[in-house]
């Protein structure tokens, strides 16, 4: 036997569903298709943002390693030599995310050697 409190919750949820879908079959079908499309588009958008932020983080990681004056950390146990501070500077000109101290670091670090 379902407790009355739980039954009331179920009824509220069912009423909400009926109200939102206006319970006429046609609009339920239409709505579900557009909702599926909306969810699909949202999924695509989230995936796009994930891609954008993935690369931003990757770029920022390189910048941070250098700005902190740390050698770029070995990614695995492979043959990675210690790196000089100026070996692979990533210069960021996204000004709003750089404090003055960071900017000074970048200026010092970007005595970029020509390849």
């Amino acid at each position: 036997m379902i407790p009355a409190k739980d039954m009331a919750k179920v009824m509220i949820v069912m009423l909400a569903i009926c109200f939102l879908t206006k319970s006429d079959g046609k609009s339920v079908k239409k709505r579900s298709v557009s909702e599926i499309q909306l969810m699909h588009n949202l999924g695509k958008h989230l995936n796009s943002m994930e891609r954008v932020e993935w690369l931003r983080k990757k770029l920022q990681d390189v910048h941070n390693f250098v700005a902190l004056g740390a050698p770029l950390a070995p990614r695995d146990a492979g043959s990675q030599r210690p790196r000089k501070k100026e070996d692979n500077v990533l210069v960021e000109s996204h000004e709003k995310s750089l404090g003055e101290a960071d900017k000074a670091d970048v200026n010092v670090l970007t005595k970029a050697k020509s390849q």
Epitope: R51, L55, K58, R75, S93, H94
Partner: antibody, heavy 120, light 111 residues
């Protein structure tokens, strides 16, 4: 199919300024980073820098920092590469390239290239 | 910078014969996420580069199965099982574990 269409070839004199463009179409321009790659005559490919058009976050290769400026106008889905004072050594083919759709760490679509010739 | 070194720099191949290009990186390209950020591009004459292989061994969409990539860490190989006339051009390896750098290119021509 994704398209990156670059502006036409340019012939300039040393000391002149230049801005070349790369217009993206058939995809959402603000969902991908756009990189610029240089190819000097008869030489290999060099990555110059990259921009995210959504907020103009821009990163440069150390070799090109201070030499060029990368920008974007998301309202017209266009990225730019510009020089304030060209040198003869800037003579090269310049490509724009889009961050991969599912190969996130690489470039999967490229513009046709813009040939820049700097000569007195 | 991570330096990418390709060998040979040029290759002349008889149609139908195999070809192999080597690429060595100055540092391991294996990332902490388990992926190895090594790619192969082909630049045909008068065209922009086109992606062939991503993450060492995965063929990009539309790339014929005669192209294959292998390797790990710092040593990588691109193989063409049977070279065709349309395969001529310059092949580049590229790393993206740390910014982007390309190998100097290997020019493939038909005998």
């Amino acid at each position: 199919e994704v398209q990156l269409v670059q502006s036409g070839a340019e012939v300039k004199k040393p000391g002149e300024s230049l801005k070349i463009s790369c217009k993206g179409s058939r995809y959402i321009f603000t969902n991908y980073w756009i990189g610029w790659v240089r190819q000097m005559p008869g030489k290999g490919l060099e990555w110059m820098g990259i921009i995210y058009p959504g907020d103009s976050d821009t990163r440069y290769s150390p070799s090109f920092q201070g030499q060029v400026t990368i920008s974007a106008d998301m309202s017209i889905s266009t990225a730019y590469l510009q020089w304030s004072s060209l040198k003869a050594s800037d003579t090269a083919m310049y490509y724009c390239a889009r961050q991969g759709d599912y190969v996130w760490g690489s470039f999967d679509s490229w513009g046709q290239g813009t040939l820049v010739t700097v000569s007195s | 910078d991570i330096v990418m070194t390709q060998t040979p720099l040029s290759l002349s191949v008889t149609p139908g014969q195999p070809a192999s290009i080597s690429c060595k990186s100055s540092q391991s390209l294996l990332d902490s996420d388990g992926k190895t950020y090594l790619y192969w591009y082909l630049q045909k004459p008068g065209q922009p580069p086109q992606l062939l292989i991503y993450e060492v061994s995965n063929r990009f969409s539309g790339v014929p199965d005669r192209f294959s990539g292998s390797g790990s860490g710092t040593d990588f190989t691109l193989k063409i099982s049977r070279v065709e006339a349309e395969d001529v051009g310059v092949y580049y390896c590229m790393q993206s574990i740390q910014l982007w750098t390309f190998g100097q290119g290997t020019k493939v021509e038909i005998k």
